[in-house]
């Protein structure tokens, strides 16, 4: 058995349903995406040995599903998947990878072929600990590369300052596949949000630990860099589920006046 979870139940139906639903969010010029053709292109990877799937095996899938990402709307992340999805609000606020078509269809799913058979493996799938060229990691590598290449304007990045190993994973999708593929001539600046979990530890903030490494890397690449601790709009969203926690107390005079009234 592999170390990862097996192929998601009803993979094809979920994929096609998400694709059809997403089309309505696309611009009039791009909404005629052929979901069946996109699925068939994706399925190429499901016909290969589960440790022999390369990022390039998803090239046709990406070419068929790719669409424009509005300027200033890109939102990269590490260790904050659910918070990013909630904050992006189905492309309304931002368009992270999970909110572009080729990311949406696979978000939170798993897939692979059986090792010595043609069927899908619903029991387990390989992770990077099993083998590097597994279907899921190769998919997100290829999708991340494309997402970076198509991003423009202000680049936003949400990192988790409560993560025990540090806010910026030196080895991760953002570091290894996204930063190297940012198109410098299309980008005005990079804005990092270091979020801390409500009531959670403050492991790192802007300018500390791994964040210094990230800042140096981006500045060395010639990017204009800024960093915000606990970006308020995201913090307010976090506080929805922790309204009585001291971290969520409204500190403004206007709020105090409202409470008295």
């Amino acid at each position: 058995r592999w170390r990862g979870e097996g192929t998601s139940a009803h993979l094809r139906d979920i994929f096609l349903g998400r694709c059809a639903e997403y089309r309505a969010l696309l611009s009039p010029e791009q909404r005629n995406k052929n979901c069946t053709a996109i699925w068939e292109a994706f399925k190429v990877a499901l016909d290969k040995d589960p440790c022999s799937v390369l990022p390039s095996d998803y090239d046709l899938f990406i070419n068929l599903s790719r669409h424009s990402i509005p300027r200033d709307k890109s939102l990269f992340w590490e260790n904050s998947h659910l918070l990013v999805n909630s904050f992006a609000d189905n492309t309304r606020r931002f368009m992270p990878l999970s909110d572009v078509l080729y990311g949406r269809v696979a978000d939170f799913l798993s897939w692979c072929r059986q090792k010595n058979d043609s069927g899908l493996d619903y029991q387990s799938c390989p992770t990077s600990e099993d083998c590097e060229n597994n279907p899921v990691d190769s998919f997100w590598k290829r999708a991340s590369i494309q997402y970076s290449k198509d991003s423009s304007g202000v680049i936003h990045v949400m990192l988790n300052g409560s993560e025990p190993t540090g806010a910026y994973p030196i080895k991760g999708f953002f570091a290894d596949y996204e930063i190297p593929n940012l198109q410098k001539e299309k980008i005005t600046r990079i804005e990092i949000w270091v979020m801390h979990e409500i009531g959670g530890p403050n492991v790192e903030s802007c300018g500390e630990g791994s964040m210094k490494v990230l800042e140096k890397r981006l500045k060395d690449m010639g990017f204009q860099y800024s960093c915000i601790n606990d970006y308020r709009p995201v913090k307010l969203l976090q506080c929805v589920d922790h309204s009585t926690h001291p971290d969520c107390a409204l500190k403004s005079a206007a709020a105090a006046t409202q409470r008295k009234a």
């Epitope: 009039p28 791009q30 909404r31 424009s68 300027r71 198509d150």
Partner: antibody
């Protein structure tokens, strides 16, 4: 307010090429596609092609593929259309319009192809 | 490419009458159809999009209906300013295409 200002009328010889412009203002240029549509005298509207403002995507009608070329200059929020190998059949008014719904149109550029 | 067949090619009507123009798509375009009005020597103007949503400032006497492959534009109580040409156009992804047009003339 949204405006699309097109270049002035052109008179060109058969076989030549022409490049017309469409300068946009009043909206975020990179967020929308710009379409080109032509209308020959006494005829209907004919879609030529479109390009997105960030210059990532474009598409052309099968009829104009290889002969029409759309380009953008993001710094001036201007879209250009070059049409090559012109014949008298290309004499028409050429409109640019902002996508995705073609709600805003330029005033049109009249092209006359004649020797 | 998706073909749009518009009919009639022309029609004559009087002020106050109701007219209907139809547009048939060669394949399913769901509700992604728009209608434009064009006056002589002027740029086209968006009347209706998504089959039945009226464009900015378009009078309520205009209405669109249909879905899939069959669509129509209805003009109630024709006004003098309504005379001109009308075109359907799909916005279900590029390449966009237009119908051949309907010329509406005063009887």
């Amino acid at each position: 307010q949204v405006q699309l200002q097109q270049s002035r009328a052109e008179l060109v010889m058969p076989g030549a090429s022409v490049k017309m412009s469409c300068k946009t203002s009043g909206y975020t240029f990179s967020d929308y596609w710009v379409h080109w549509v032509r209308q020959r005298p006494g005829q209907g509207l004919e879609w030529i092609g479109a390009i997105d403002g960030s210059d990532t995507f474009n598409d052309y009608s099968q009829k104009f593929k290889g002969r029409a070329t759309l380009t953008v200059d993001e710094s001036s929020s201007t879209v250009y259309m070059q049409l090559s190998s012109l014949t008298s059949e290309d004499s028409a008014v050429y409109y640019c319009a902002r996508g995705g719904l073609l709600q805003y149109w330029g005033q049109g550029t009249t092209l006359t192809v004649s020797s | 490419d998706i073909q749009l067949t518009q009919s009639p090619a022309s029609l004559s009507a009087s002020v106050g009458e109701t007219v209907t123009i139809t547009c048939r798509a060669s394949e399913n375009i769901y509700s992604y159809l728009a209608w434009y009005q064009q006056k002589q020597g002027k740029s086209p103007q968006l009347l209706v999009y998504n089959t039945k949503t009226l464009g900015e400032g378009v009078p309520s006497r205009f209405s669109g209906s249909g879905s899939g492959t069959q669509f129509s534009l209805k003009i109630n109580s024709l006004q003098p300013e309504d005379f001109g040409s009308y075109y359907c156009q799909h916005h279900y992804g590029t390449p966009f295409t237009f119908g051949s047009g309907t010329k509406l003339e005063i009887k």
